[in-house]
């Protein structure tokens, strides 16, 4: 079911159109559902979800992560700073979502849906942001070389990278969701 068309709600007459905040909330939860499906396949396929060797692979990645200074946590919450961080982080995740595209067998469509839904989410959030100048877009050349590097890893590292991207993206989105609900 696409976001904004929760199957429970389809038959409800005279539904109020979704507000911008509700649309963003639904969009994030839709992406999170997609990530859950992808993580299920990853965890069933390998023991990566239980692995203690994550630190080895994590060193090669520079995955976006929320920190206190970003203003998205309950302590030191700052709406504008946080929104910039969310958009910047999502833009940085795009290259990793591109990497995921050939990493799934039974959930190939789900991986594409997560990628495309994230692009839509970024557009929603950019409309909400006042300070678009503060948002830095990743360099395409850097992204291209990163993608090549990730794809050249051995099988074990590729599996670990897939697991870490999904875990980090889930965490980032859930932190974003909590923060956006305060705005």
């Amino acid at each position: 079911v696409p976001p904004g068309e929760d199957s429970k709600d389809v038959a409800a007459p005279h539904r109020q159109p979704l507000t911008s905040s509700e649309r963003i909330d639904k969009q994030i939860r839709y992406i999170l559902d997609g990530i859950s499906a992808l993580r299920k396949e990853t965890c069933n396929k390998s023991n990566m979800c239980e692995s203690s060797k994550e630190a080895l692979a994590e060193n090669n990645l520079n995955l976006p992560k929320m920190a206190e200074k970003d203003g998205c946590f309950q302590s030191g919450f700052n709406e504008e700073t946080c929104l910039v961080k969310i958009i910047t982080g999502l833009l940085e995740f795009e290259v990793y979502l591109e990497y995921l595209q050939n990493r799934f067998e039974s959930s190939e469509e789900q991986a594409r849906a997560v990628q495309m839904s994230t692009k839509v989410l970024i557009q929603f959030l950019q409309k909400k942001a006042k300070n678009l100048d503060a948002i830095t877009t990743p360099d395409p050349t850097t992204n291209a070389s990163l993608l090549t590097k990730l794809q050249a890893q051995n099988q074990w590292l590729q599996d670990m990278t897939t697991h870490l991207i999904l875990r980090s993206f889930k965490e980032f989105l859930q932190s974003s969701l909590r923060a956006l609900r305060q705005m």
Partner: antibody
Framework: QVQLVESGGGLVQPGGSLRLSCAAS????????MTWVRQAPGKGLEWVSS????????AYADSVKGRFTISRDNAKNTLYLQMNSLKSEDTAVYYC????????????????WGQGTQVTVSS | DIQMTQSPSSLPTSLGDSVTITCQAS??????LSWYQQKPGQTPKLLIY???RLQTGVPSRFSGRGSGTSFTLTISGLEAEDLATYYC?????????FGQGTKVELK
């Protein structure tokens, strides 16, 4: 099977400190949000604090903000609650709870609860 | 902060009755609502999450409905083991908040 075992409760004077621990077993601790919930004698449930899996993101009830600190040690499968400047109204049974979720569910809800540890603040 | 108003606080009933408890949020919480059962001297137990999803192992006589600001928990055909206090919890935004509780007891 999933087990949550709280410890560290006891009798403390107003203004004093206590550190509660919750030892978790039977699941991949690092994958789950964890929460402290308390219940004063004869009263209802009160959400106290939550800590999220890897982000270090924490949240507190207004009644404990600035006095309590939640933390976790994923290597030791342990959740903590450092309670400072304790008041008589902090007297309660403190429950350690696991949030639904891990790999799949994204919604909130506490599916496993420890037996609780009694904290009494009295002079 | 989002306030949760649960009613009634006490519900005298008879075995076999259908029982409905209501939880009202002061602003929209989407479907981020869960319901808990607590029997005297026991730890709370999750019944419903996501407003309407039945937790594994919970009897199907329990059901949850609602979205936005208004939510209900229904027990269809009350059994003796259902006599307890029930709480709702909003998990939408900080600080999360429980309802005041509803004690389901015999008349």
């Amino acid at each position: 099977q999933v087990q949550l075992v709280e410890s560290g409760g006891g009798l403390v004077q107003p203004g004093g400190s206590l550190r509660l621990s919750c030892a978790a077993s039977g699941f991949t601790f690092s994958n789950y949000y964890m929460t402290w919930v308390r219940q004063a004698p004869g009263k209802g449930l009160e959400w106290v604090s939550s800590i999220y899996s890897f982000s270090g993101d924490t949240a507190y009830a207004d009644s404990v903000k600035g006095r309590f600190t939640i933390s976790r040690d994923n290597a030791k499968n342990t959740l903590y609650l450092q309670m400072n400047s304790l008041k008589s109204e902090d007297t309660a049974v403190y429950y350690c709870t696991r949030n639904l979720g891990g790999v799949v569910v994204t919604t909130n809800g506490y599916d496993y609860w420890g037996q609780g540890t009694q904290v009494t603040v009295s002079s | 902060d989002i306030q949760m108003t649960q009613s009634p606080s006490s519900l005298p009933t008879s075995l076999g009755d259908s029982v409905t408890i209501t939880c009202q949020a002061s602003q929209s919480i989407s479907d981020e609502l869960s319901w808990y059962q607590q029997k005297p001297g026991q730890t709370p137990k999750l019944l419903i999450y996501g407003a309407s999803r039945l937790q594994t192992g919970v009897p199907s006589r329990f059901s949850g409905r609602g979205s936005g600001t208004s939510f209900t928990l229904t027990i269809s055909g009350l059994e003796a083991e259902d006599l307890a206090t029930y709480y709702c919890l909003q998990g939408y935004s900080w600080p999360f908040m429980f309802g005041q509780g509803t004690k389901v007891e015999l008349k």
